[in-house]
């Protein structure tokens, strides 16, 4: 089941997935001045069998002005400046994406890809939050959000993260004003199912890596 909404927005924070569950779709979007090749794939789809998952379909962009020139090679350095990186800028990658059954790793960029990636996440997907550069994290719990199915509707859990400017005088963590959950009630009251995850330890690590930045925006 696809998640009906985007993961929650946290001021001065970005999120990313470390691995993508089977069923996730990534729209084949091209940057301005380029378009998908004629009859080209509309999206990539994470799919596979119990032992191996990979992205089916390939995104290909071509210049809007010229015909029959297809591009799908890895971007050159000057082109990479144009798109926001999808990798964490840190050697401490929390999970080995390849080792997660039923998941795909971050799809490689395609030439002339749009700057923003439009992902369609599925129930059970987890994303990790991190404060942007210049802000530091105050958190009472995991800086993650999971898409859950509750009473037949999908919703994202609220990440327990507040990003505060480093120059600001901030409250002590114990005095933080609690962030409201999407329905305005505590998690325990709204959830019909409890999901535990193997990611818990890695999540804490990801949340505290303040030197690394996520810059991709997901829709």
């Amino acid at each position: 089941e696809l998640c009906d909404d985007d993961p929650p927005e946290i001021p001065h924070a970005t999120f990313k997935a470390m691995a993508y569950k089977e069923g996730t779709m990534l729209n084949c979007e091209c940057k301005r001045g380029f378009r998908r090749i004629k009859s080209g794939s509309l999206y990539m789809l994470c799919t596979g069998n119990s032992s191996h998952s990979s992205w089916d379909n390939q995104c290909q962009c071509t210049s809007s002005a010229t015909r029959n020139t297809t591009k799908q090679v890895t971007p050159q350095p000057e082109e990479q400046k144009e798109r926001k990186t999808t990798e964490m800028q840190s050697p401490m990658q929390p999970v080995d994406q390849a080792s997660l059954p039923g998941h795909c790793r971050e799809p490689p960029p395609w030439e002339n890809e749009a700057t923003e990636r439009i992902y369609h996440f599925v129930v059970g997907q987890m994303v990790y939050y991190q404060c942007v550069q210049g802000y530091r994290a105050l958190h009472r719990g995991p800086a993650e959000s999971v898409c859950k199915m509750t009473h037949g509707k999908t919703r994202w859990t609220q990440p327990q993260l507040i990003c505060t400017g480093e120059m600001e005088t901030s409250q002590f963590p114990g005095e933080e004003k609690p962030q409201a959950s999407p329905e305005g009630r505590p998690e325990s009251e709204t959830s019909c199912l409890v999901t535990t995850t193997d990611f818990q330890i890695q999540t804490e690590m990801a949340a505290t890596m303040e030197t690394s930045i996520f810059t991709t925006e997901y829709q």
Partner: antibody, heavy 117, light 104 residues
Framework: QVQLVQSGAEVKKPGASVKVSCKAS????????MHWVRQPPGQCLEWMGA????????SYSQKFEGRVTITADTSASTAYMELSSLRSEDTAVYYC??????????WGQGTTVTVSS | QIVSTQSPDTQSVTPKEKVTITCRAS?????MQWYQQKPDQSPKRWIY???KSASGVPSRFSGSGSGTDYTLTINSLEAEDAATYYC???????FGCGTKLEIK
Amino acid sequence: QVQLVQSGAEVKKPGASVKVSCKASGYSFTRYWMHWVRQPPGQCLEWMGAIYPGNSDTSYSQKFEGRVTITADTSASTAYMELSSLRSEDTAVYYCSRDYGYYFDFWGQGTTVTVSS
Amino acid sequence: QIVSTQSPDTQSVTPKEKVTITCRASSSRSYMQWYQQKPDQSPKRWIYDTSKSASGVPSRFSGSGSGTDYTLTINSLEAEDAATYYCHQRSSYTFGCGTKLEIK
């Protein structure tokens, strides 16, 4: 539950245009690609094109490009397919269908378009 | 443009018979989808990712294949299986022209 309800049958003259609607309910309309597929009497299914209502991105089959326009009204959760310069060969049942990624999971009931002078 | 060619066009079969429908793509693909359509009905998702059954599809249906050649098999045909089956290439959105199964 997910439903796609299409507009009623149309009879058109050659050279005219037809606009078929597809009203979606029971899901987040902006987050799924919506496709249009047609089926002339006793013939194959033909993919015409698709729209992503979230940003109005469209893709068309080369066979219909220039004659077909697919649009979406997100406030009404409705997709539209307009086919112009109709000819007798365009007589067909036209379907809208939601793209689940793995497959087209929900289809409209179909709209019969008859082109006749 | 990728073309998917199905065979046979029509097959007349008896209940309990094993039925095989084939679909050949004009270029190698990763996966194939299959739809079932009954007269005066919209198509229904049937098999996806070559071999996975959509929800509600009886276990007598199976799919296989790779590269350019794909197969839909019905192990022991039942009367309710009378329909037209279409293969579908999701990367190019092209459909085969269908195989109509008629019950003898």
